[in-house]
């Protein structure tokens, strides 16, 4: 019996087609992805093949103005329109709190939303009961397939799930649910979830009875053969893991942003064992037409976005200096504003020992593309912020050793004075440079804000200590020459859309007046 698994993950509100790098579509003839194009391909496959499941491995939420405005209603609407069969909860589904998940998505989705390792407690337990499930048995033709969900246990540090959801260890939580499916005579089981490729592989290895793992979170691109676009494969598709009980378990993921549709064909024997698995992600490029009906619906929903982008978010009573003359040479107040917003967006009261789990931010000055003049009645709009942060990136959470941070700050000024983009703006960091010293030895003082303290204060950076830092995904991926970050990072979790982080902060503060306050000094 053959099953076709179509899968997406980390779509991050890319409802419209995008450029090849998943930013805003500029030249339509070369654009990719989007739900209208995805629908065309899904329908093509549904028409051609008998047993098809369309699955999503989480993080539909967060990433463009679509999410900012529609807050998840767009996800439910268009996933319903595409007739998804199941979705696993990702960490970003909690970005607007539990209410921001329940109302727009859980209550409106026609498909089951899954996670076996999220347990509700207290008053939330009855409110959310039945709205998401640990697993769902799906009929497919004359057979049944069990889908069991999972979500990153790091979600409390990455999003806003509140205090009434407990995120258990994935493997510990999955095993009893898989065992339950087995007792229900379900012998074909897919683990669908959002914890990253390393955890996906562990699930394939450790959870007895899981036949296939469909993952997300790490934006992993797998491919067999010559890849069709710019993404470099992290391994073959499917990636085969040998389980502890000797089975070959296919593990898949489909990069991110709706650029690809994962396509996996699994052949099962009559006892539900995987006999063979093959496939590849399908690049959703312009050779696949956008479905006219879905496209018309997208255009209808778009109208509200255009109205939103000109509305006032808040006011500034000072000039927000985002000029390259400032931000690529010295501390600039636009850099301070953005870093403060980044930290504010990551406030999660961890426990009594820590005032927060992260206190530091770094931001390449070259990523700040425009100032905002306060003389326009102080008004700040989404449109203004889109000029400052035009690349559609995210502000991510990484873990780095102190020694890596030191290298990053050396790189920040290794060719100072040439108006290059790698000069770092900061938050929760005091750095002093001596430009008279040779490149690679210019950082003379580097103090960082403590987290394990009740009164935050600055302490010298320790080379062997592991620190959490918020930074643009561009830097996490080694952009602007920060190869040491990419090579040496110990953990990387993708965060919220850059503009959204800053706009939320401005809306919250109502009136802003960031200063230049001595975060970056030259001796």
């Amino acid at each position: 019996w053959e099953l076709t698994i179509l899968h997406t993950n980390d779509v991050h509100s890319r409802l419209e087609q995008t450029s090849e790098d998943s930013s805003k579509c500029v030249n339509a003839s070369r654009c990719m992805g989007g739900v209208a194009r995805l629908f065309t391909k899904v329908q093509q496959i549904r028409r051609a093949e008998p047993n098809v499941l369309l699955l999503d491995a989480g993080d539909q939420y967060q990433g463009t103005i679509w999410f900012t405005v529609y807050k998840g209603a767009e996800v439910a609407h268009f996933m319903n329109a595409l007739r998804y069969d199941a979705m696993a909860l990702g960490n970003h589904e909690f970005d607007n709190g539990v209410e921001g998940l329940i109302e727009p998505l859980l209550k409106e989705a026609k498909f089951p939303i899954l996670s076996a390792n999220i347990k509700a407690k207290g008053p939330l337990a009855s409110q959310i009961s039945g709205l998401y499930l640990p697993y769902k048995v799906l009929p497919v033709g004359d057979e049944v397939v069990g889908i069991v969900g999972y979500t990153s246990k790091e979600t409390p540090f990455l999003s806003n799930p509140g205090t009434n959801l407990v995120f258990e260890d994935e493997i510990t939580a999955l095993q009893p649910e898989v065992d339950k499916l087995k007792t229900l005579n379900v012998n074909k089981i897919i683990a669908l979830g959002h914890s990253g490729f390393e955890t996906d592989k562990l699930i394939a290895q450790k959870v007895r009875g899981v036949d296939v793992v469909v993952g997300g979170h790490s934006n992993t691109f797998l491919y067999t053969g010559n890849p069709p676009s710019k993404e470099v494969p992290a391994g073959k598709y499917p990636f085969i893991v040998t389980s502890d009980d000797g089975r070959k378990v296919p593990v898949v993921q489909a990069y991110a942003f709706g650029k690809y549709l994962g396509y996996l064909k699994i052949e099962f024997d009559e006892r539900g064992n995987v006999i063979s698995s093959h496939g590849n992600p399908i690049l959703l490029n312009s050779s696949i037409p956008e479905d006219p009906s879905i496209k018309a619906d997208i255009n209808k929903w778009r109208i509200k976005l255009d109205n939103y982008s000109t509305q006032e978010l808040g006011k500034t009573i000072v000039y927000l200096d985002g000029s390259s003359q400032s931000c690529r040479f010295r501390e600039c107040n636009m850099g301070n504003l953005i870093c403060d917003a980044m930290i504010n967006n990551n406030l999660r009261h961890a426990d009594e020992m820590f005032w927060n789990h992260v206190s530091m931010c770094i931001l390449n000055g070259g990523g700040i593309r425009s100032p905002i003049d306060e003389r326009n009645n102080g008004t700040i709009t989404w449109e203004n912020l889109a000029a400052v942060l035009p690349f559609g990136g995210t502000f991510d959470l990484v873990q780095l050793k102190g020694s890596t941070l030191k290298k990053a700050f050396e790189h920040s000024v290794h060719r100072y004075g040439q108006s290059t983009g790698e000069f770092l703006q900061v938050g929760g960091i005091h750095v002093v440079y001596d430009l008279s010293r040779k490149p690679g030895d210019r950082v003379v003082k580097l103090d960082v804000l403590c987290t394990k303290c009740r009164v935050p204060s600055y302490d010298p950076l320790k080379m062997d200590e592991i620190y959490k830092v918020i930074l643009p995904n561009f830097l996490a991926n080694g952009g602007d020459g920060f190869q040491m970050i990419k090579d040496e990072l110990l953990r990387h979790d993708s965060g919220d859309q850059d503009i959204n982080v800053v706009s939320t902060y401005i809306s919250k503060m109502k009136v802003i007046y960031p200063a230049v306050e001595g975060r970056i000094k030259f001796s």
Partner: antibody, heavy 121, light 107 residues
Framework: QVQLVESGGGVVQPGRSLRLSCATS????????MHWVRQAPGKGLEWVAV????????YYPDSVKGRFTISRDNSKNTLYLQMNSLRAEDTAVYYC??????????????WGQGTMVTVSS | DIQMTQSPSSLSASVGDRVTITCRAS??????LAWYQQKPEKAPKSLIY???SLQSGVPSRFSGSGSGTDFTLTISSLQPEDFATYYC?????????FGGGTKVEIK
């Protein structure tokens, strides 16, 4: 092969009740949504009810809502339609039809031969 | 409710003719449309689903097209066994609704 066989039709007085059955074979009944569709003499097709594969949801058009109840017995591979408060306009051939394997609305790939229901005093 | 309007309500054609039947939805239904054939005193038979997919066992002279609100059923070369009534049906949302039917008669 796949088969749907309706029974239970007949002549009934207005206001009375009737229960139709649809016995199925040749496929995994519990995996499919099942529908009733009717056709009044000389008229077109009208959808009457659906029950999802697991019995979790049932939908009806306004014309029969509150009077007709669709149900299923997965252990017997049988679909039912309980028709109460029958009216003259319910006179039709009633077909049982197989839908899809999900909770989304679907088309009908297999139809029964139909059973005639006449509501007349 | 979504109204389905079929046209024409009847047509006369000869064997070998190309026949086109149209179906219009009162609102967008994407490609969630099916076509059925019904002969007198018989149950309907599924021809096409998802606007353009041929049900297995249906001759390739039948084809469907369209998306959104406007759909077409085409019989490329009418055969004697094709004289029947044809219905479209939307399954975008409940309640499911049918078109009024198109009767294809022998000229």
């Amino acid at each position: 092969q796949v088969q749907l066989v309706e029974s239970g039709g007949g002549v009934v007085q207005p206001g009375r009740s009737l229960r139709l059955s649809c016995a199925t074979s040749g496929f995994t009944f519990s995996n499919y949504g099942m529908h009733w569709v009717r056709q009044a003499p000389g008229k077109g097709l009208e959808w009457v009810a659906v029950i999802l594969y697991d019995g979790s949801n049932k939908y009806y058009p306004d014309s029969v809502k509150g009077r007709f109840t669709i149900s299923r017995d997965n252990s017997k591979n049988t679909l039912y339609l309980q028709m109460n408060s029958l009216r003259a306009e319910d006179t039709a051939v009633y077909y049982c039809a197989r839908g899809g394997s999900s909770w989304y609305p679907d088309s009908f790939d297999i139809w029964g031969q139909g059973t005639m229901v006449t509501v007349s005093s | 409710d979504i109204q389905m309007t079929q046209s024409p309500s009847s047509l006369s054609a000869s064997v070998g003719d190309r026949v086109t039947i149209t179906c219009r939805a009162s609102q967008g239904i994407s490609s969630w449309l099916a076509w059925y054939q019904q002969k007198p005193e018989k149950a309907p038979k599924s021809l096409i689903y998802a606007a353009s997919s041929l049900q297995s066992g249906v001759p390739s002279r039948f084809s469907g097209s369209g998306s959104g609100t406007d759909f077409t059923l085409t019989i490329s070369s009418l055969q004697p066994e094709d004289f029947a009534t044809y219905y479209c049906q939307q399954y975008n949302s409940y309640p499911l609704t049918f078109g009024g039917g198109t009767k294809v008669e022998i000229k």
